[in-house]
């Protein structure tokens, strides 16, 4: 069987939701010594980056200027060390936002609720769309989808303090082209007596997976890598 290198990790820097006409940055984290990285869009080659010097950095950044609906979709990356190619990374969905109009978000019974009450978010957008998305700040990967002509509902079960936080909604014209975000609605949940001390609070920083962690190899890392390689050989 054809030998391949481990698959790289693909990430969006800061966010996978990019306003139209702004620049998107995708990171492909592979391996020290990789001489070439390829970015693929919807299965086709989109861009190539060659790190300099290849043995000192474990990935590259791909800059996608002037974001638009034609550049929104599924991206993946691969890398090469010598003649050996890696497996393909997981797919990353890159979304263009700020298309067309701005929806409005409302919550029933209101933004201040008590633990155990059932809550429903309503997102409304008058221009033609069929899909609506609800996101919680700090949890942007946990997208809830709902369908409707002009408005959509997002029912939530009996709430706990874990539901506290800011929510926004989008209208979606296709999976990768979203409207402007709604104004945020901050949900405040009180009275969760049983588990208030254990209730997670929302991070105020961006999602941890939306960060590019590319590192330059130092002498120490090189020594460690050499020690690890020697240890592996001894174990064999």
């Amino acid at each position: 069987p054809k030998q391949t290198l481990p698959k790289p990790i693909i990430r969006a820097e800061s966010t996978y939701m990019v306003p139209k006409e702004k620049q998107a940055t995708l990171c492909c984290q592979g391996s020290y010594g990789a001489v070439e990285y390829q970015l693929h869009f919807e299965g086709s080659l989109f861009a190539v980056e060659r790190p300099k010097p290849p043995e000192r950095i474990n990935g590259v950044k791909f800059h996608i200027p002037d974001m638009n609906s034609r550049k929104a979709g599924r991206y993946s990356c691969i890398y090469r060390v010598g003649e050996l190619w890696s497996e393909r990374s997981d797919l990353l969905d890159l979304v263009v936002t700020e298309m067309y109009d701005t929806p409005t978000l409302s919550v029933h019974p209101g933004p201040e609720v008590t633990s155990g009450e059932k809550v429903t978010f309503y997102c409304r957008l008058d221009t033609a769309t069929s899909m609506f998305l609800l996101l919680k700040e700090g949890r942007s990967r946990d997208v809830q989808r709902s369908y409707g002509k002009v408005q959509a509902e997002f029912p939530m079960g009996p709430v706990t303090t874990a539901h506290r936080g800011s929510y926004r909604c989008f209208g979606s014209y296709n999976n990768y082209a979203w409207s402007f975000p709604s104004e945020p609605v901050k949900l405040l949940v009180t009275g969760d007596i049983e588990n208030t001390s254990l209730a997670p609070t929302d991070p105020t920083f961006p999602d941890s997976w939306d960060t590019c962690l590319l590192t330059r190899e130092t002498g120490l890392q090189k020594d460690l890598a050499l020690w690890d390689h020697t240890a592996q050989n001894l174990l064999r």
């Epitope: 409005t104 409302s106 019974p109 209101g110 155990g116 409304r124």
Partner: antibody, heavy 115, light 107 residues
Framework: QVQLQQPGAELVKPGASVRLSCKAF????????MHWVKQRPGQGLEWIGM????????KYNEKFKSKATLTVDKSSSTAYMQLSSLTSEDSAVYFC????????WGQGTLVTVSA | DIQMTQSPSSLSASLGERVSLTCRAS??????LNWLQQEPDGTIKRLIY???SLDSGVPKRFSGSRSGSDYSLTISSLESEDFVDYYC?????????FGGGTKLEIK
């Protein structure tokens, strides 16, 4: 002090339409849901629908979808409910109730459908 | 639609007596339940929201509680102005629905 002001009564002919009003005082009208509720003489309460003045989101009880239309006028802090193709079955007291949890209630408007 | 079965439909009691009214929900409504009071002139006032939270200005003799799908309104010591109609209302799942009402009469 929160107040929801509704006219006392409306007399309408069968087949006609009527627009009921509910004017809000003492709170930020655009921040809270407005509900409409029906009560036939000597009967219980039935929810018709609700509207959020800020977003324009409306939600209707399926039973009243072709009967009632909810609107608001933000500038006058007034909610409206239009009832169409009236019959004797529509003779009832109609209440508006402000806030998602029905915290504040109007006095109700008695609608009488009669030739 | 969620059915709210309210019992009893009428209740005769004496001044100072303790009484409980019950609503049973046909589906899970969490704590999304109100208790309303309606005067003979039609005026409606909310007493309890979110199952057990007392509205401001409502006397402490009124309280709300829950046991599974059964929700109760308790009046600890009846006063003359309490002999009116009471309704429960669920606002968990649209369409929001009311119980059939309880007429509280003086014995």
């Amino acid at each position: 002090q929160v107040q929801l002001q509704q006219p006392g009564a409306e007399l309408v002919k069968p087949g006609a339409s009527v627009r009921l009003s509910c004017k809000a005082f003492g709170y930020t009208f655009t921040s809270y849901w407005m509900h409409w509720v029906k009560q036939r003489p000597g009967q219980g309460l039935e929810w018709i629908g609700m509207i959020h003045p800020n977003s324009g989101v409306t939600k209707y009880n399926e039973k009243f979808k072709s009967k009632a239309t909810l609107t608001v006028d933000k500038s006058s802090s007034t909610a409206y409910m239009q009832l169409s193709s009236l019959t004797s079955e529509d003779s009832a007291v109609y209440f508006c109730a402000g806030d998602g949890r029905f915290a504040y209630w109007g006095q109700g408007t008695l609608v009488t459908v009669s030739a | 639609d969620i059915q709210m079965t309210q019992s009893p439909s009428s209740l005769s009691a004496s001044l100072g007596e303790r009484v409980s009214l019950t609503c049973r929900a046909s589906q899970d409504i969490g704590n999304s339940l109100n208790w309303l009071q309606q005067e003979p002139d039609g005026t409606i006032k909310r007493l309890i929201y979110a199952t057990s939270s007392l509205d401001s200005g409502v006397p402490k003799r009124f309280s709300g509680s829950r046991s599974g799908s059964d929700y109760s309104l308790t009046i600890s010591s009846l006063e003359s102005e309490d002999f009116v109609d009471y309704y429960c209302l669920q606002y968990a799942s649209s369409p929001w629905t009311f119980g059939g009402g309880t007429k509280l009469e003086i014995k």
